[in-house]
Interface confidence: low
C-alpha cells in the first residue's frame, strides 16, 4: 500500500482556497477506501489535530469543528481511492504538516498508510489598483472614473499590480470588460487582453483579431504598471473595465498554482458613437432662381464630433433628385476624406464648386443654374474612423432634409418655316432650302442654331432609318457638315438674323428625300457654358431632282 500526496512544501496565501489531493494504491480490501486528514502545527509538531474524515462525521477536533460544519473545510471524494482536502479560506494557523491517513483494510500490514505534505501560509500582499494611463482626459471626480471616448479614438487604461511576497512568484495581469451596470463575476467579465505570467500577451476571443491587427495593445511599463490601449474604439467597447491580477507560484512538482487573485475597477467607459452624433443641416432654405443665375447651397455637419485628422475623417456630398423623382437622387459633387472634390456623372463639364468654407460648413456652388437643375437637394455626410491601421472604416452617415430648388424656365417659343427656293429643281443644279425662324420670349443675348436633316425614301416610301444630319450652323456661328446622300458638296450659312440656308450643289437622284430644318435657342451662362432654352422643327420639304428632257 502507498499513500500519495503532493510534494511539499506548498506555498499558499491567507484568505485563498487550497486543495490538497491524496490517493492510495496497492491496497487490499474494498475499492472504496477511507481517508483521515490531520494537521501538525509548527508550534506542536508531535500533536496530530484531526481535521476531517470520510468515515466519521465527528472526527474533527474543536479547532476545525465549526469550519467543517460550515463547509469551509471538507474532504471531497474523487473516486474510491482518491480524495481532496479543500480549505475555502486559509488562515495563518493553517500552516503546518498535513497528513493523509488511510485506515488499513489489508490482510496484513504492508507498505505506508499515510502521506505528509507541508503547507506554508503566506500573507496576502497582492495589490491591484487603477493607474492613470498617461495624461488623463477630462474625468468626473468619481471613483472609478467615468470616461467618454469618441468612436474611433484610442481608449487607454492603466493598472498597477504589485506583490511583495517573499517567495518567487509571477504575476499575470488581464484587462476585462463587463457590460455597464452588470454585476461583476467570471461569467459577466469578458477578457479583453492579458499578460500571462510568462509575459505572453493573449486576447479574449472577440478581441484576438484586433490584437493581431495591432489595434489592441498591452504593455508593461516599469515594474508594476500595465497599460492597455484599444485603438479605434467601437460602440461595443463601452462598459466597465477591470484589471485582474493573479499571482502564480511553481510547486515542487513543477506545476504552476495560482495562489492569489485580485480585481480592481478601472473605469466606466462610454463610447460616443459617431452615428449618435452626426447631424446634417442645409440652408438657406427653398431657393427660386432664374436660369443662368448662380445657385449656392450650404451644408453644416454638426454634433459632438472629433475634429478631422488622426482618428476621424469626413466626406460630404450633394445629391439632387429631379422634381417628382423618388429616391435620394444622383450625385452632384462631393469632397472626399482628403478634401479632394469631384463632380457626379453628367456634371463634369459644368462650372460647379464644392468647398469647405468653415471647419464644418460646406458649400455647393453651381455657377449658372439651368432648368434641369431644379429638384430637391440633400447633403450627405459620412464619418469614418481610423483604428491603429491607416485604413478608414465608415462609422456613420447622415442625410439632410430635402431642400427644394426651383429654376425658372426660359419661356422661349420657336417656330420654323422651311421651303425649297424656286419650288422645282433639276439634276445637276443647286437646290437652295431656306429656313425662317421666329422667336418669342427668352432672355437678352439669346443665340440661335439651326440644323438640316433628311429622310430618304426606299421603294417609294420613307425609310424607317432615322433622319440624317446634312449640316447646320451652331449658336457660336460655326458650320457643321453632316452626310449628303448624293455625296456632292454642301454649304450651310446664315443669310439673315433669323434665316438659314442649305445648298446642295450638283444634285443627283440620291439627293431625293424629305428635308426639315431644326432650330434651337441657346443661352450662354456666366460660366461660359451653353444651355439649350428651346427647340422647334419645321414642316417637311420634299426635294425631287427632276430630269431635264435632254437627259432621257
Amino acid at each position: 500500500r502507498e499513500v500519495l500526496v503532493p510534494e511539499g512544501p506548498l506555498y499558499r496565501v491567507a484568505g485563498t482556497a487550497v486543495s490538497i489531493s491524496c490517493n492510495v494504491t496497492g491496497y487490499e480490501g474494498p475499492a472504496q477506501q477511507n481517508f483521515e486528514w490531520f494537521l501538525y502545527r509548527p508550534e506542536a509538531p508531535d500533536t496530530a489535530l484531526g481535521i476531517v474524515s470520510t468515515k466519521d462525521t465527528q472526527f474533527s477536533y474543536a479547532v476545525f469543528k465549526s469550519r467543517v460544519v460550515a463547509g469551509e473545510v471538507q474532504v471531497q471524494r474523487l473516486q474510491g481511492d482518491a480524495v481532496v482536502l479543500k480549505i475555502a479560506r486559509l488562515q495563518a494557523q493553517d500552516a503546518g504538516i498535513y497528513e493523509c491517513h488511510t485506515p488499513s483494510t489489508d490482510t496484513r500490514y504492508l507498505g505506508s498508510y499515510s502521506g505528509k505534505v507541508e503547507l506554508r501560509v503566506l500573507p496576502d500582499v497582492l495589490q491591484v489598483s487603477a493607474a492613470p494611463p498617461g495624461p488623463r482626459g477630462r474625468q468626473a471626480p468619481t471613483s472609478p472614473p467615468r470616461m467618454t471616448v469618441h468612436e474611433g479614438q484610442e481608449l487607454a487604461l492603466g493598472c498597477l499590480a504589485r506583490t511583495s511576497t517573499q517567495k518567487h512568484t509571477h504575476l499575470a495581469v488581464s484587462f476585462g470588460r463587463s457590460v455597464p451596470e452588470a454585476p461583476v463575476g467570471r461569467s459577466t467579465l469578458q477578457e479583453v487582453v492579458g499578460i500571462r505570467s510568462d509575459l505572453a500577451v493573449e486576447a479574449g476571443a472577440p478581441y484576438a483579431e484586433r490584437l493581431a491587427a495591432g489595434e489592441l495593445r498591452l504593455g508593461k511599463e516599469g515594474t508594476d504598471r500595465y497599460r492597455m490601449v484599444v485603438g479605434g474604439a467601437q460602440a461595443g467597447d463601452a462598459g466597465t473595465y477591470h484589471c485582474t491580477a493573479a499571482e502564480w507560484i511553481q510547486d515542487p512538482d513543477g506545476s504552476w498554482a495560482q495562489i492569489a487573485e485580485k480585481r480592481a475597477v478601472l473605469a466606466h467607459v462610454d463610447v460616443q458613437t459617431l452615428s449618435s452624433q452626426l447631424a446634417v443641416t442645409v440652408g438657406p432654405g427653398e431657393r427660386r432662381i432664374g436660369p443662368g443665375e448662380p445657385l449656392e447651397l450650404l451644408c453644416n455637419v454638426s454634433g459632438a464630433l472629433p475634429p478631422a485628422g488622426r482618428h476621424a475623417a469626413y466626406s460630404v456630398g450633394w445629391e439632387m433628385a429631379p422634381a417628382g423623382a423618388p429616391g435620394p437622387g444622383r450625385l452632384v459633387a462631393q469632397l472626399d476624406t482628403e478634401g479632394v472634390g469631384s463632380l457626379g456623372p453628367g456634371y463634369e463639364g459644368r462650372h460647379i464648386a464644392m468647398e469647405k468654407v468653415a471647419s464644418r460648413t460646406y458649400r455647393l456652388r453651381l455657377e449658372a443654374a439651368r432648368p434641369g437643375d431644379a429638384g430637391t437637394y440633400r447633403c450627405l455626410a459620412k464619418a469614418y474612423v481610423r483604428g491603429s491601421g491607416t485604413r478608414l472604416r465608415e462609422a456613420a452617415s447622415a442625410r439632410s432634409r430635402p431642400l427644394p430648388v426651383h429654376v425658372r424656365e426660359e419661356g422661349v417659343v420657336l417656330e420654323a418655316v422651311a421651303w425649297l427656293a424656286g419650288g422645282t429643281v433639276y439634276r445637276g443644279e443647286t437646290a437652295s432650302l431656306l429656313c425662317n425662324i421666329s422667336v418669342r420670349g427668352g432672355p437678352p443675348g439669346l443665340r440661335l442654331a439651326a440644323s438640316w436633316w433628311v429622310e430618304r425614301p426606299e421603294d417609294g416610301e420613307l425609310s424607317s432609318v432615322p433622319a440624317q444630319l446634312v449640316g447646320g450652323v451652331g449658336q457660336d456661328g460655326v458650320a457643321e457638315l453632316g452626310v449628303r446622300p448624293g455625296g456632292g458638296p454642301v454649304s450651310v450659312e446664315l443669310v439673315g438674323p433669323r434665316s438659314h440656308r442649305l445648298r446642295l450643289h450638283s444634285l443627283g437622284p440620291e439627293d431625293e428625300g424629305v428635308y426639315h430644318c431644326a432650330p434651337s435657342a441657346w443661352v450662354q451662362h456666366a460660366d461660359y457654358s451653353w444651355y439649350q432654352a428651346g427647340s422647334a422643327r419645321s414642316g417637311p420639304v420634299t426635294v425631287y431632282p427632276y430630269m431635264h428632257a435632254l437627259d432621257t
Partner: antibody, heavy 123, light 105 residues
Framework: AVTLDESGGGLQTPGGGLSLVCKAS????????MQWVRQAPGKGLEWVAG????????AYAPAVKGRATISRDNGQSTVRLQLNNLRAEDTGTYYC????????????????WGHGTEVIVSS | ALTQPSSVSANPGETVKITCSGS?????YGWYQQKSPGSAPVTLI????KRPSDIPSRFSGSKSGSTGTLTITGVQADDEAVYFC??????????FGAGTTLTVL
C-alpha cells in the same frame, strides 16, 4: 514672416479679470487654429486654450475651464483670451501660438509662437 | 502631463535622445526648445517628425508605439536649453511634458 504679438498683460488683482489679445500678421489667420499657452515662473509650459479656424470648436485646460473664454476675429487677425476670477496661480507669461492645421486642439501641432506677455496676479 | 526625463547631458558632438510618452489623444507629438524661462519657445518638430524649414537637420523626431522621441545629432553648446514635448489628451485638449533640461558638458 509669421508674427504673433500678445498684449494685455500686467499687474492684475485676485478675483479680477484680464483680456489678452494676440495680433497675427504674415499669414491668413482664418485658415488655422490658434492656441494660448502659459508658463508660470520657474515652471514648464501649460496649455491653456485652443480655438479652431472658424471658432466653432473651443477647448480649455481643466485649470481654467469655466473661467476662460477664447475667441477670434478673423477679419482683424486677432485672437482673444478672457480670464476671469483671477488667482495667484494664473501668474506667468502667456504665449499665443499658431498651429499647422485648421482644427487640431493638439499641443503637438504648433509651428509658431509669440514672444509672450507677462501677467502678475497679486494684491 | 506627458512623461519626459527631467534632464539629460551630453558631450559636444554626441547624439542625444529625449523621449516623451503618455499621449492618450492624438498620439502626435511636437518638440519645443526654450533657451531661458520667459523667452519664447521655438518649434523644432511638429506632427512627430516634421521639421520647420529654418530648423537645422540635426534635430529630428520620430514616434514608436506611444512614445515620441527627439533626436539631436552632433550636440552643440548652443543646444543647451529646456526641451518640451506637446500632444493632446483624449478630450481634444493640449498637454505638455514637464520639460527636459539638456546640459552640454
Amino acid at each position: 514672416a509669421v508674427t504673433l504679438d500678445e498684449s494685455g498683460g500686467g499687474l492684475q488683482t485676485p478675483g479680477g479679470g484680464l483680456s489678452l489679445v494676440c495680433k497675427a500678421s504674415g499669414f491668413s489667420i482664418s485658415s488655422y487654429e490658434m492656441q494660448w499657452v502659459r508658463q508660470a515662473p520657474g515652471k514648464g509650459l501649460e496649455w491653456v486654450a485652443g480655438i479652431d479656424d472658424d471658432g466653432s470648436s473651443r477647448a480649455y485646460a481643466p485649470a481654467v475651464k469655466g473661467r476662460a473664454t477664447i475667441s477670434r476675429d478673423n477679419g482683424q487677425s486677432t485672437v482673444r483670451l478672457q480670464l476671469n476670477n483671477l488667482r495667484a496661480e494664473d501668474t506667468g507669461t502667456y504665449y499665443c501660438a499658431k498651429t499647422i492645421y485648421a482644427a487640431t486642439l493638439n499641443a503637438g501641432e504648433i509651428d509658431a509662437w509669440g514672444h509672450g506677455t507677462e501677467v502678475i496676479v497679486s494684491s | 502631463a506627458l512623461t519626459q526625463p527631467s534632464s539629460v547631458s551630453a558631450n559636444p558632438g554626441e547624439t542625444v535622445k529625449i523621449t516623451c510618452s503618455g499621449s492618450s489623444g492624438s498620439g502626435y507629438y511636437g518638440w519645443y526648445q526654450q533657451k531661458s524661462p520667459g523667452s519664447a519657445p521655438v518649434t523644432l518638430i511638429y506632427d512627430n517628425d516634421k521639421r520647420p524649414s529654418d530648423i537645422p537637420s540635426r534635430f529630428s523626431g520620430s514616434k514608436s508605439g506611444s512614445t515620441g522621441t527627439l533626436t539631436i545629432t552632433g550636440v552643440q553648446a548652443d543646444d543647451e536649453a529646456v526641451y518640451f514635448c506637446g500632444s493632446a489628451d483624449n478630450n481634444y485638449t493640449g498637454i505638455f511634458g514637464a520639460g527636459t533640461t539638456l546640459t552640454v558638458l
